[in-house]
């Protein structure tokens, strides 16, 4: 059938979702597209438990998540409600800082070295995490 019952090769299963952790860096939009081409999305963190799981796998490295405010309000890429949902920002963040000298503010969220979140320039080449839910229409594990 078309239901995914197990995670693709090189993905990690956790709480009925599959996660893929990059070991290289891309700008936020490129990371977002990368995940979409895997029939997935940048990780959406909905609980403290999921936060701890992702944090354990990425280590102390800046890593993109599926949260941005490029069109105004903060939005999760899968439509999860931001206002009522889980948040783990660093103190004083997000601050839409303009002082970096790269033009514009900071519209994309990432995990920092301690796991808490920061907003940053979307063009920075950070690692990223893709997530897809089990039991949704998708493909079998890749065979190479």
């Amino acid at each position: 059938g078309s239901e995914r019952t197990c995670c693709p090769v090189n993905w990690v299963e956790h709480e009925r979702s599959c996660y893929w952790f990059s070991r290289s860096g891309k700008a936020w939009a490129d990371a977002d597209n990368y995940c979409r081409l895997e029939d997935a999305h940048l990780v959406v963190v909905t609980s403290w438990e999921e936060q701890k799981f992702v944090q354990h796998h990425i280590g102390p490295v800046n890593t993109w998540m599926g949260l941005h405010d490029q069109n105004g309000p903060w939005k999760w890429v899968d439509g999860t409600d931001y206002e009522t949902g889980f948040k783990n920002w660093r103190p004083e963040q997000p601050d839409d800082w303009y002082g970096h000298g790269l033009g514009g503010g900071e519209d994309c969220a990432h995990f920092t070295d301690d796991g808490r979140w920061n907003d940053d320039v979307c063009q920075r080449p950070y690692r990223w995490v893709c997530e897809t839910e089990l039991d949704k229409a998708s493909q079998e594990p890749p065979l190479l």
């Epitope: 891309k26 490129d30 990368y34 029939d39 080449p125 493909q139 890749p142 065979l143």
Partner: antibody, heavy 121, light 108 residues
Framework: EVQLLESGGGLVQPGGSLRLSCAAS????????MSWIRQAPGRGLEWSSV????????YYADSVKGRFTISRDNSKNTLYLQMSSLRAEDTAVYYC??????????????WGQGTMVTVSS | DIQMTQSPSSLSASVGDRVTITCRAS??????LNWYQQKPGKAPELLIY???SLQSGVPSRFSGSGSGTDFILTISSLQPEDFATYYC??????????FGQGTKVEIK
């Protein structure tokens, strides 16, 4: 054996339409994003379009956006490219290619033999 | 979009020669750089991925190096079957892949 076999090319008048097909075998087709890449006579390679394994996500080069539609039928292990409003500059060999990726490794690892599309009056 | 520029556009060499082809990206692409070989009338074939990793089945006389914006494909000792056109390709800002214009390696 992993194989991609394109068909559907031919001569078409400017403004006309054509549908290319690519039959895949030897691998789990629905597990991979697939792409169309073209090469005008005597010219280099130009990426044209890509579709995710489920068909849920598609992307196009600016040169074909709004005129070409990539699709797939995973039950038939077949990739398609519907081309409309064709122009002389669309004349090329069209290759279908399998995308393989795992982070740094993001490549077109299997290519078909190509099918020629000629747009001329 | 990221532009890829190869040089030279063509070169003449003899069997046994060491050949180098360069590829420059219009912005940093880290190591997201692949090389393909295309023989006349045939489809391209993957040679090297991630700037320096050799694709399975490709002879060890092919090697790649570089990161950021500047990359090199080297053929340590040119063989008769290596006369072909070589393309670099960036996979940094997927899904907009771009190729270099190609380098044709001809027999001197």
């Amino acid at each position: 054996e992993v194989q991609l076999l394109e068909s559907g090319g031919g001569l078409v008048q400017p403004g006309g339409s054509l549908r290319l097909s690519c039959a895949a075998s030897g691998f789990t087709f629905r597990s991979y994003a697939m792409s169309w890449i073209r090469q005008a006579p005597g010219r280099g390679l130009e990426w044209s379009s890509v579709i995710s394994g489920s068909g849920g996500s598609t992307y196009y080069a600016d040169s074909v956006k709004g005129r070409f539609t990539i699709s797939r039928d995973n039950s038939k292990n077949t990739l398609y490219l519907q081309m409309s409003s064709l122009r002389a500059e669309d004349t090329a060999v069209y290759y279908c290619a399998k995308r393989y990726n795992s982070g740094w490794h993001d490549v077109f690892d299997i290519w078909g033999q190509g099918t020629m599309v000629t747009v001329s009056s | 979009d990221i532009q890829m520029t190869q040089s030279p556009s063509s070169l003449s060499a003899s069997v046994g020669d060491r050949v180098t082809i360069t590829c420059r990206a219009s912005q940093s692409i880290s190591r997201y750089l692949n090389w393909y070989q295309q023989k006349p009338g045939k489809a391209p074939e993957l040679l090297i991925y991630a700037a320096s990793s050799l694709q399975s089945g490709v002879p060890s006389r092919f090697s790649g190096s570089g990161s950021g914006t500047d990359f090199i494909l080297t053929i340590s000792s040119l063989q008769p079957e290596d006369f072909a056109t070589y393309y670099c390709q960036q996979s940094y800002n997927t899904p907009t892949w771009t190729f270099g214009q190609g380098t044709k390696v001809e027999i001197k």
